[in-house]
């Protein structure tokens, strides 16, 4: 596959597809009733627009990003997803107590479009 | 800046309990865990147990389970490790350490409390 | 016996690249992460790399972590006699322990 596409955003500043943090309880994310701690989580995501051939992850996005330039109504654009991810640990309620368990991809680390 | 001051070396003998402490400065106590790794002389790390200082969770390697207690007083801001028994085979380096954000290592460590245990 | 296996020594001339590696296991470094530490002699250990590849802030971009199928790997280029130290790669094991590996000496010569 060619190199990725760069990552100049046609949209302006902070409109494509990049990397975005939210601050979230437990009672937020609907996990207080199994996840002891961290009480508060930063979560990554991936967020924002993929126009033309911005961060396109494979030839595949780059394919559809021009389909969809001649058909949009058919063809949706290529959607900001996570490239990669952080794993998190979490402290959860068992039946016999606490425990660790640990998350692979929980967290987006980097995102690209796809 | 982050630091975690640790109480200082201890010469105990068999039998006897030790508490030690390890106390954090410079961040959100509350908002990171602690964890507590054993370095045996000339030996390398284990890792101990864990504690929330925010809820007082704690969890423990298996190895060390019913062996040592973790605590926290976080209106002082300080961890603890403490042996109601303690064995020979207790002589060892101890550390706690911070644990990095997501929890998956650890970012900041203490100077060390060296145990000594002989009768 | 660790779950995480290292060789015990290294040793490189000042200058060269040295690798220090760090096997595990399909319950851990293969689909998990891998961390990195430093322990110079006498001090407490100083996180090194963190997930697989990313150093803090001040570590020198002379070190590097990588880490393909359940083996990781430790570099160091431009070997500096004050890099002499310990070193010990971290991960999880599948019940969610927090795994040393049984640590390397490295030894700058000369």
């Known amino acids: 596959a060619r190199a990725r596409n760069g990552d100049h955003c046609p949209l302006g500043p902070g409109r494509c597809c990049r990397l975005h943090t939210v601050r979230a309880s437990l009672e937020d994310l609907g996990w207080a009733d199994w996840v002891l701690s961290p009480r508060e989580v930063q979560v990554t995501m991936c967020i924002g627009a993929c126009p033309s051939q911005f961060r396109a992850a494979n030839m595949h996005a780059q394919i559809k990003t021009s389909l969809h330039r001649l058909k949009p109504d058919t063809v949706p654009a290529p959607c900001c997803v996570p490239a990669s991810y952080n794993p998190m640990v979490l402290i959860q309620k068992t039946d016999t107590g606490v425990s660790l368990r640990t998350y692979d991809d929980l967290l987006a680390k980097d995102c690209h479009c796809i | 800046e982050v630091q975690l001051v640790q109480s200082g070396a201890e010469v105990k003998k068999p039998g006897e309990s030790l508490k030690i402490s390890c106390k954090g400065s410079?961040?959100?106590?509350?908002?990171?865990?602690i964890g507590w790794v054993r370095q045996m002389p000339g030996k390398g790390l284990e890792w101990m147990g864990v504690?929330?200082?925010?809820?007082?969770?704690?969890i423990y390697s298996p190895s060390f389970q019913g062996q040592v207690t973790i605590s926290a007083d976080k209106s002082i801001s300080t961890a603890y490790l403490q042996w109601s028994s303690l064995k020979a085979s207790d002589t060892a380096m101890y550390y706690c350490?911070?644990?990095?954000?997501?929890?998956?290592?650890?970012?900041?460590w203490g100077q060390g409390t060296l145990v000594t245990v002989s009768s | 016996q660790s779950v995480l296996t290292q060789p015990p020594s290294v040793s490189g001339a000042p200058g060269q690249r040295v690798t220090i590696s760090c096997s595990g296991s399909?319950?851990?470094?293969?689909?998990?992460?891998v961390n990195w530490y430093q322990q110079l002699p006498g001090t407490a250990p100083k996180l090194l790399i963190y997930?697989?590849?990313n150093r803090p802030s001040g570590v020198p971009d002379r070190f590097s972590g990588s880490k393909s199928g359940t083996s990781a790997s430790l570099a160091i280029t431009g070997l500096q006699a004050e890099d002499e130290a310990d070193y010990y790669c971290?991960?999880?094991?599948?019940?969610?322990?927090?795994?040393f590996g049984g640590g390397t000496k490295l030894t700058v010569l000369g």
């Open positions: 410079g961040y959100s106590f509350t908002s990171y865990w």
């Open positions: 350490a911070r644990y990095g954000r997501y929890g998956t290592y650890f970012d900041y």
């Open positions: 504690i929330d200082p925010d809820g007082s969770y704690t």
């Open positions: 997930s697989n590849d």
């Open positions: 971290q991960s999880w094991d599948s019940s969610s322990n927090y795994v």
């Open positions: 399909s319950s851990n470094i293969g689909v998990l992460y």
